[in-house]
């Protein structure tokens, strides 16, 4: 059972254990083709040098060869991401060859020791897929690996042994312990193949980071941040999942690079795109939502080929299931000033109307704090289309930033007790669509009436010249 | 057809050991992995742990870690159980059965069970 | 361990009526769309004998009137209607995490 130190406790005592006496097994890497999308079916195992199974099994040489490549196992089987992965690539690639790497008896040892064999099973795919290079019309170009957590690495390593360059490797939330900081020819890399994508689900620069941070591929893809995924709070998991520990929320997260990924080839009308951006604090600023000079990209297996980019770090927004597509929108508010704000930070809320539909009250995140008389981006997503907006309702709360400041509050409350009520002055809002890259204005409906009081609302529409109000005087901030 | 083939009752002695062999025919034996269970007299079916066909990797399940072997020998595909100190409480009926290592790993083959008596 | 709770213990049933045994999860065996949860019968003095897979899928040479139900933690297997040789027990079995567990069993008599 999990260790109670924290989410980690598992791997971290498995990274620290002494190594264990171990009987002699057999180091094993079987290739097993997939043959059918039905998850029962035992497959077919090819063997190096042996061309029958290649032509019993109906190996195609001239379609895509995807190999899927499992991690580090606890339990010694297969988990049950698998076969969801298989079918998926199965729906959406019918002519496909989709070979599972079955390295259960390496993988299934002491962390640290599965690590250590990462490279050997990397050797047994390159030497597979230079004994398919052999076989007239098979092209290393259609050849697609894609590893998860350990597995990404072992690709990573597959990828610098084989004689040629394979076409793209998809690391799936690439294991951090013992991997974060190495050198580029220990772990997954963008020389390791003509284009390497990576999403990152399960990264925290406090504790042990199950999937690695630094970026390792052509394009890196942070979904949410790559830390804390939607529907993988303990509540989540302890409600509605297969899981009921802590240790399952880490799997959650971790495993969230898989469902991502089955989500691109599954869901191919509802794809998601992510923005390249510096950090993840400047995403939630919303100050990141562009597709220019190839700045966002879909994520998955629609990722645009990007080979001139290295370290491309992208983030996006998603759902807590599939479809996991969200639409990101940009916020550009200008508070014009303040009226006997004390040390009161102003939270605001937003509900977007639309052509399609009508969200739900978003709250705008604070990153840093509000700016007067300056103007304050923020990021807000909704879970479905709205189509075209049409309006903007706008409230806004108090909320104190401690204790401190809260009883400061409250006894100038009480020692005048006929303040003046608190006001904001906003007089336009300004929307980004990160997916149609629209740029609208939204000015309020009356201009003589701008002001707005905690818990009261303020309504915008369209401004009838598009992005700038006339008469403006204050400069107006170029979207990026 | 595909069919797993026990060896038969065994009478044993508290303290001896016993092994137990299951002989697969009709499919690839290294292609499904091998699972033990467990039925003592008039009750339900406890899971042993199984055997990577392949590697020869075993997994035991809690309460059968120590006295309880599974082995292979892949040139007859046969996989065995040795249970050695035998006690009163092993007294049951030990099935061998396969599984997918792909899919939802129910087991799909079962032996016809092997009775191990243990008594003085 | 996932711990599998079936009801009732035993059941007795005429020819041609319904018999209904269920089995609840101690959590969720759903995986996405999938339930690992399956149904074994065991006549006296043979080994279990896989009737349904993945809660509702019908394992080979398996006649009809064997149908399963269920997501999540809640399960039923349903046999309609009942004959004779039905006589047995029934057991569920989880596999979405190891170790595998089997439920208690449900004993099945034909009046």
């Known amino acids: 059972s999990p260790t109670p130190f924290g989410p980690e406790g598992q791997l971290a005592d498995e990274l620290h254990k002494p190594k264990a006496i171990q009987t002699e097994v057999k180091p094993s890497v079987r290739f097993n083709l997939r043959t059918s999308k039905d998850p029962e079916h035992e497959g077919c195992y090819l063997s190096l040098g042996h061309s029958q199974p290649l032509e019993d099994c109906g190996f195609n040489m001239t379609a895509k060869t995807f190999f899927i490549i499992h991690g580090w196992t606890m339990s010694g089987i297969f988990e049950n991401w698998l076969h969801k992965l298989v079918s998926a690539l199965h729906t959406r690639e019918k002519d496909a060859n989709v070979v599972v790497v079955d390295w259960l008896p390496l993988a299934h040892q002491l962390y640290t020791d599965a690590v250590n064999n990462t490279r050997v099973v990397g050797h047994s795919i390159a030497r597979m897929l230079d004994w398919l290079q052999e076989k007239d019309d098979f092209s290393l170009g259609n050849v697609h690996l894609i590893g998860y957590s350990l597995g990404a690495h072992v690709a990573g390593y597959a990828g610098n042994f084989v004689k040629g360059t394979v076409g793209r490797i998809t690391g799936l939330d690439p294991a951090g312990p013992m991997f974060e900081g190495a050198d580029i020819h220990k772990r997954l890399s963008p020389d390791d193949a003509d284009f390497v994508d990576v999403l990152h689900t399960y990264t925290r620069s406090f504790g042990l980071s199950i999937g690695i941070q630094m970026p390792v591929g052509h394009i890196d893809i942070y979904p949410n941040g790559g830390d804390f995924q939607p529907g993988c709070g303990l509540n989540d998991v302890l409600g509605s999942m297969a899981y009921g520990t802590i240790t399952e929320v880490v799997k959650c997260e971790h495993e969230r690079a898989v469902h991502l990924f089955v989500d691109s080839l599954v869901n191919q009308d509802k794809p998601s795109f992510a923005f390249q951006c510096t950090d993840s604090n400047r995403f939630k600023k919303g100050i990141c939502l562009s597709c220019r000079k190839n700045r966002c990209n879909s994520i998955g297996y629609n990722a645009k080929k990007m080979r001139n980019k290295r370290n491309s770090k992208m983030y996006l927004k998603t759902r807590a299931g599939m479809p996991f597509r969200v639409y990101h929108y940009q916020m550009k508010i200008h508070v014009f000033s303040y009226k006997n704000m004390g040390e009161i930070e102003p939270t605001f809320y937003v509900t977007l109307y639309g052509t399609n539909a009508d969200s739900q009250t978003l709250p705008l995140e604070i990153v840093e704090r509000i700016e007067q008389n300056a103007t304050n981006t923020f990021l807000v997503y909704t879970e479905e289309d709205l189509g075209d907006l049409l309006k903007i309702q706008l409230t806004w709360e108090g909320a104190s930033q401690s204790w401190y400041n809260l009883w400061k509050e409250l006894r100038s409350y009480l020692s005048q007790p006929h303040n003046p009520g608190r006001e904001l002055n906003i007089r336009r809002i300004r929307v980004k669509s990160g997916e149609t890259q629209r740029k609208l204005t939204f000015c309020a409906e009356d201009p003589e009436n701008t002001s707005i009081s905690p818990g009261r609302e303020l309504w915008f529409r369209k401004c009838r010249d598009g992005w700038r109000m006339k008469n403006e005087t204050s400069p107006t901030v170029e979207l990026p | 057809q595909v069919q797993l083939v026990q060896s038969g009752s065994e009478l044993k002695k508290p303290g001896a050991s016993v092994k137990v062999s299951c002989k697969a025919s009709g499919y690839t034996f290294t292609n499904y992995g091998m699972n033990w269970v467990r039925q003592a007299p008039g009750q339900g079916l406890e899971w042993m742990g199984w055997i990577n066909t392949y590697s020869g990797v075993p997994t035991y399940a809690g309460d059968f870690k120590g006295r309880f072997v599974f082995s292979l020998d892949t040139s007859v595909s046969t996989a065995y159980l040795q249970i050695s100190s035998l006690k009163a409480e092993d007294t049951a009926v030990y099935y061998c059965?396969?599984?997918?290592?792909?899919?939802?790993?129910?087991?799909?083959?079962w032996g016809k069970g092997t009775t191990v008596t243990v008594s003085s | 361990d996932i711990v599998l709770t079936q009801s009732p213990a035993s059941l007795a049933v005429s020819p041609g009526q319904r018999a209904t045994i269920t089995c609840k999860a101690s959590q969720s065996v759903d995986y996405d769309v999938d339930s690992y949860m399956h149904w074994y019968q065991q006549k006296p003095g043979q080994p279990p004998k896989l009737l349904i897979y993945a809660a509702s899928n019908l394992a080979s040479g398996v006649p009809a009137r064997f149908s399963g139900s269920g997501s999540g933690t809640d399960f039923t297997l349903t046999i309609n209607p009942v004959e004779a040789n039905d006589t047995a027990n029934y057991y569920c079995?989880?596999?979405?995490?190891?170790?595998?567990?089997f439920g208690g069993g449900t004993k099945v008599e034909i009046k």
């Open positions: 079995q989880q596999t979405i995490e190891d170790p595998p567990t």
């Open positions: 059965a396969r599984r997918g290592y792909y899919g939802r790993r129910y087991f799909d083959v």
